[in-house]
């Protein structure tokens, strides 16, 4: 099988591969399609040993415009030759293809989190899945940004071992009766554009400024 053919039409799909809650999610958008597909089928093979394209079971005849590939794409060294077919009823509307290399193409979505404000500190609870595959750790670090009155402070909590299970971080030495906003994101070791979570804000209750984070618990 040869994937090097010199005639390339402008692809009719835009793909994005993201690590969402430590799952590999491939999503797509269609460009200039007058007829919207009723369903899609996703197929792939590994470029280093091209075989027949394999249909992704949970993404065959799917109406969704995304596909969870965590259990299919296990290697950060391989390039995955991917074909997306769009159908309307029994008619094939289009087929687009792209090669993905997780080590360089992956973008990292922020984890889910909650915040609870106390008099002079905020508890940030970050939710990670209970088990994360080793190859999906991607040399990531968690960043928690605290914003108040135009000042942004970055916190880089040290997480022992894998990013798995729930993680709580305390932002302390805060000023009572002040509005604080928090954003979290995953930072890659490379200069990659980060995807920050939407801000979550809380107005801290009034209280004694000398009150310690411990006594507020």
């Amino acid at each position: 099988i040869s994937y090097d053919s010199p005639d390339y039409t402008d692809e009719s799909c835009t793909f994005k591969i993201s690590l969402r809650n430590f799952r590999s999610i491939l999503s797509w958008e269609l460009k200039n399609h007058s007829i919207v597909p009723t369903h899609y089928t996703l197929l792939y093979t590994i470029m280093s040993k091209p075989e027949d394209l394999k249909v992704v079971k949970n993404c065959a005849n799917t109406t969704r415009s995304f596909c969870d590939l965590t259990d299919e794409w296990r290697s950060t060294h391989e390039a995955y030759v991917t074909v997306l077919e769009g159908f309307s009823g029994n008619t094939t509307l289009f087929s687009c293809s792209h090669n993905f290399w997780l080590a360089i193409d992956m973008s990292f979505e922020p984890p889910e989190f909650e915040i609870v404000g106390f008099t002079n500190h905020i508890n940030v609870m970050v939710k990670f899945p209970s088990i994360v595959e080793e190859e999906l750790q991607f040399d990531l670090s968690l960043v928690i940004e605290e914003q108040s009155e135009g000042i942004v402070k970055k916190h880089k909590p040290e997480i022992k071992g894998n990013m798995s299970g729930n993680f709580t971080y305390i932002i302390d030495k805060l000023i009572p009766n002040t509005n604080y906003c928090v954003s979290v994101y995953l930072e890659h070791s490379d200069e990659q554009a980060v995807i920050k979570s939407p801000l979550k804000c809380t107005l801290l209750p009034p209280g004694q400024e000398s009150e310690s984070a411990e006594s507020a618990k």
Epitope: Y3, D4, S5, P6, Y8, F15, M47, S48, R74, S75, T76, H77, E78, A79, S97, H98, N99, W101, A103, I104, D105, M106, S107, E134, E135, D190, E191, Q192, A193
Partner: antibody
Amino acid sequence: QVQLQQSGPELVRPGVSVKISCKGSSYKFTDYAMHWVKQSHAKSLEWIGVISTYYGNVKYNQKFKGKATMTVDKSSSTAYMELARLTSEDSAVYYCARSSGSYLDYWGQGTSVTVSS
Amino acid sequence: DIVMTQTPLTLSVTIGQPASISCKSSQSLLDSDGKTYLNWLLQRPGQSPKRLIYLVSKLDSGVPDRFTGSGSGTDFTLKISRVEAEDLGVYYCWQGTHFPYTFGGGTKLEIK
């Protein structure tokens, strides 16, 4: 036949920057990442980094962070590497090489950069 | 970073005779996916590098079967069963298991 055509030799003064290019042809450019490799007499071959030609994501060798900046122009199927604040240690031949995953399969012909006052 | 050490530095061989190049890595190149991303390149005089072997032993298309790659973990070998004139140049091993990718210092194959 897959081709990676690199820009011509550069003779530059110390302290300035230089931007070299690598144009891919006869294959779908955005399906392959592009690597840059330095070859000097002193250090043999050194991997500088890799760029996703589809997303523009980059991965650098720590040693070249701040020295090299990789970019890509999808519309012209061209990858670029800019080398900043050049010194005599940057005199070398620079190669681009495409890869599917960790497999570098085709290399450009190389661009010679000579830094001299 | 992983250090790749190649020996010998220079290899002088008569045409038709065998040749062997050793490559050792400072840590194992076996990845968690079960594959070993050890590769060999040949750079002929005045040319750019060309891929010979990937994944320890897989020959690139067009590479003659007199070339064989072997090894595992940290010790690897490139063998040429019968050297031909077109084989002269510098041979490099390199690893793609761990970032940053790293190269051996090269072995120059000369024809006696």
